[in-house]
Interface confidence: medium
């Protein structure tokens, strides 16, 4: 793997910026000289800089007073592409007095533990020794961008280098790009791309379906404003820089439309006056749907064609259709909408409903006690049912017992072919009512109006029917 | 890493071949191949441009139109289409991959400007 | 569209010289340069990238430079190996409009 070189600087340094080979990174200090106390920064000429000297205190001979600690200055800033090596140091020349002289390096603030390659090597000489401390990173990424220092303490003092700015250079990387969208037809939009190097600049070119849209660059971030599209569209965006140029990912604009009609309308269950349906929404055309409409026609020729239509929410995909007739044939379909407007109807589907109940209650009915059997004799005629009722199939009856405070109902099926019934006597000297429903597959039609008679005790008897009058005989 | 090329040969002028580069050892999606000829005793000219992953295809201004570049992802293969050969259409025809980018994320195409892999060409000679 | 122009066309040095050649662009392409070298009958080889990058297994006797519209390849202590055409390569453009650009080469002869 070749080792990556500082390049020179494209605008101009950084603080402590100096452009030197490799070479001179690793060089050892050829004299065992101290740094001077009072030194020039190379960023601002001409100014005394002292910001990482440490003063050391006297010597134990109590007559020497030691120069100033300070590193010796180093490449200030190396840049260097994606996946390359690198391998940087610090040197300072300690003398022989100090022990256990430690360097720590520093990555932005933080301190540097843990598996990284850093070497301190040690070069002792007759007064001072040497120490040139290492850092090498294999295959540098992004994250590796920094500001790196030494660090050396000693006699608690700290000693600081100067930083080491390290600028790792790939493709542009991107922040933003643009998303997928879907849009009304001929209504401007915009789509927003950004990327990042180093290196900067990063230019900006747009794609639309393969072909560039802007002939001139834009820098990062780029805001691409579209006046309108008529039909579907792929957009990306190209981010430039001196390394080359990475393309997004491509991103569709779809055009909003109103939705295709709804499939596989079911029917779940039928009732004499209501139908539960269920649909698959059609393709929502990009654009989320809004509500539904029920579409409910009767299947009659003696019928107007007049279409009932019932509004519905979008979700759930089912509606119990309601207030429709016993025993009918209806032509159902489904329409649904979003803000386009309205798709076109479903494949309309057949379905009926079950037979009623009654609509009206037995008529003429009488009641009498026949007390030599101890029963009570019911009779009445048999409704006028409508066609939708459908077919009678029998009567359910009705009769109450009263007596001081007492109450009981009991409950009599009887076939439809009966027009007349006897019951027990339940209790002496207490008032029966009597009512009276009609029963078809369809369930139990209205009771008839109740009609009362009273049991007297035993051995009083009144023979005397009592009736609920007939329609128009009242 | 190779890339070798194949389908060269002699033809008349009017004629078509098709050309093919496969790639072994290499994630052939995540890099862009380029066609890049040679007449004898000239320099060289980059034709067309091919990135299997994404589908991005770019042709030089002297071809466009009439040469097709194409992959076969499964395979590891770029193909070059050359339909109508003329005479100036005679030279070594080199596949070459972009430099490698092992940073990119994926779902995005990186192309990195340079060729740092070359098969070693195949000759077409196209006589009039 | 920019227009890569090579000087000189051919040159000739001794072994242990050096050889410089130059690149010039019609219009500013920043770093985006590359040298690649040629032998007879074999692919180029790429030598430099964006400019003053070497390649991977390349000697550092290969050092690249300039950027914008000026660019210089210089090969210093020359051997017998370094006889061959020397070419340099931009890219332009987009990713589905761009151009990879070829100057017309530079033959170096080794004495």
């Known amino acids: 793997r070749e080792e990556a070189k500082p390049y020179p600087l494209f605008p101009g340094p950084l603080p402590g910026s100096l452009q030197t080979d490799h070479t001179s990174l690793l060089s050892l200090p050829h004299t065992s000289g101290y740094q001077p106390a009072l030194m020039f920064s190379p960023t601002q000429p001409g100014r005394p800089y002292t910001g990482n000297v440490a003063i050391p205190r006297v010597t134990s001979a109590g007559s020497k007073l030691l120069p100033p600690l300070a590193f010796k200055h180093t490449v200030g800033h190396i840049i260097l592409s994606e996946h390359k090596d690198v391998k940087f140091n610090c040197s300072i020349s300690v003398p022989n007095i100090y022990q256990d002289t430690t360097i720590s390096w520093w990555k932005d603030g933080k301190e540097l533990l843990g598996a990284h390659h850093a070497i301190t090597q040690f070069y002792p000489d007759d007064e001072v020794t040497a120490i040139i401390a290492s850092f090498s990173i294999t295959s540098v990424q992004r994250s590796d961008n920094g500001s790196y220092i030494c660090k050396m303490k000693i006699n608690n003092e700290e000693i600081v280098s100067d930083p080491i700015y390290i600028e790792v250079q790939g493709l542009p990387h991107f922040t933003k790009q643009p998303e997928s969208m879907n849009v009304t037809r001929n209504t401007a939009f915009n789509l927003t791309c950004q990327a990042v190097g180093p290196p900067e600049p990063v230019n900006i070119f747009w794609v639309q379906n393969s072909s560039r849209v802007n002939e001139q660059p834009e820098k990062s971030p780029s805001v691409l404003t579209v006046p309108g599209l008529t039909e579907m569209a792929v957009f990306s965006c190209e981010a430039h820089n001196d390394k080359g140029l990475t393309v997004s990912k491509g991103v569709q604009i779809n055009i909003k439309a109103i939705p295709s009609p709804p499939t596989e309308v079911s029917i779940h269950n039928s009732t004499a006056h209501s139908i539960l349906i269920s649909w698959v929404p059609g393709f929502d055309g990009y654009s989320p749907f809004r509500n539904c409409s029920v579409q409910v026609k009767e299947v009659d020729p003696l019928s107007n064609g007049s279409v009932m239509i019932f509004n519905t929410s979008a979700s759930p995909h089912m509606y119990q259709i309601k207030q429709l007739q016993a025993l009918a044939n209806y032509s159902i379909g489904v329409s649904c909408m979003n803000e386009i407007g309205w798709s076109a109807v479903s494949p309309w589907i057949l379905a009926s409903t079950t037979e009623g109940a009654p609509s009206v209650a037995p008529l003429n009915v009488t009641v009498f006690l026949n007390e030599s059997r101890d029963n009570v004799d019911i009779r009445w005629m048999k409704p006028l049912t409508k066609r939708q009722a459908g077919e009678l199939v029998g009567y359910r009856i009705s009769h109450v017992w009263q007596s001081a405070g007492i109450s009981k109902e009991l409950l009599e099926e009887v076939g439809q072919n009966n027009s007349r019934a006897q019951i027990s006597v339940q209790v002496h000297n207490a008032t029966c009512t009597v009512r009276i429903a009609a029963v078809t597959k369809g369930g139990v039609g209205p009771f008839s109006d109740p009609v009362k008679i009273f049991i007297p005790a035993h051995g009083w008897v009144d023979h005397a029917p009592s009736s609920t009058p007939a329609p128009g005989n009242a | 890493q190779e890339l070798v090329e194949s389908g060269g040969g002699l033809v008349q002028a009017g004629e078509s071949l098709k050309l093919s580069c496969k790639a072994s050892?290499?994630?052939?999606?995540?890099?862009?191949i380029s066609w890049v000829r040679q007449a004898p005793g000239k320099g060289l000219e980059w034709i067309a441009y091919i990135y299997p992953g994404f589908g991005i295809t770019n042709y030089a201004h002297s071809v466009k139109g009439r040469f097709t570049i194409s992959s076969d992802n499964a395979q590891n293969t770029v193909f070059l289409q050359m339909p109508s050969l003329t005479a100036s259409d005679t030279a070594t025809y080199f596949c070459a991959r972009d430099l490698d980018y092992t940073g990119g994320v994926v779902g995005y195409a990186y192309v990195t400007y340079y060729f740092t892999l070359w098969g070693p060409g195949t000759l077409v000679t196209v006589s009039s | 569209d920019p227009v890569l122009t090579q000087t000189p066309s051919s040159v000739e040095a001794a072994v242990g010289g050096t050889v410089t050649i130059k690149c010039q662009a019609s219009e500013s392409i920043s770093s985006r340069l590359a040298w690649y070298q040629q032998k007879p009958g074999q692919p180029p080889k790429l030598l430099i990238y964006?400019?003053?990058t070497l390649a991977s297994g390349v000697s550092s006797r290969f050092k690249g430079s300039g950027s914008g519209t000026e660019f210089t390849l210089t090969i210093s202590d020359l051997e017998c190996a370094d006889a061959a055409t020397y070419y340099c390569q931009t890219y332009y453009g987009g990713s589905t409009t761009g151009w990879y650009v070829f100057g017309g080469g530079t033959e170096v002869v080794v004495k």
């Open positions: 050892g290499i994630d052939f999606s995540s890099y862009g």
């Open positions: 964006s400019a003053s």
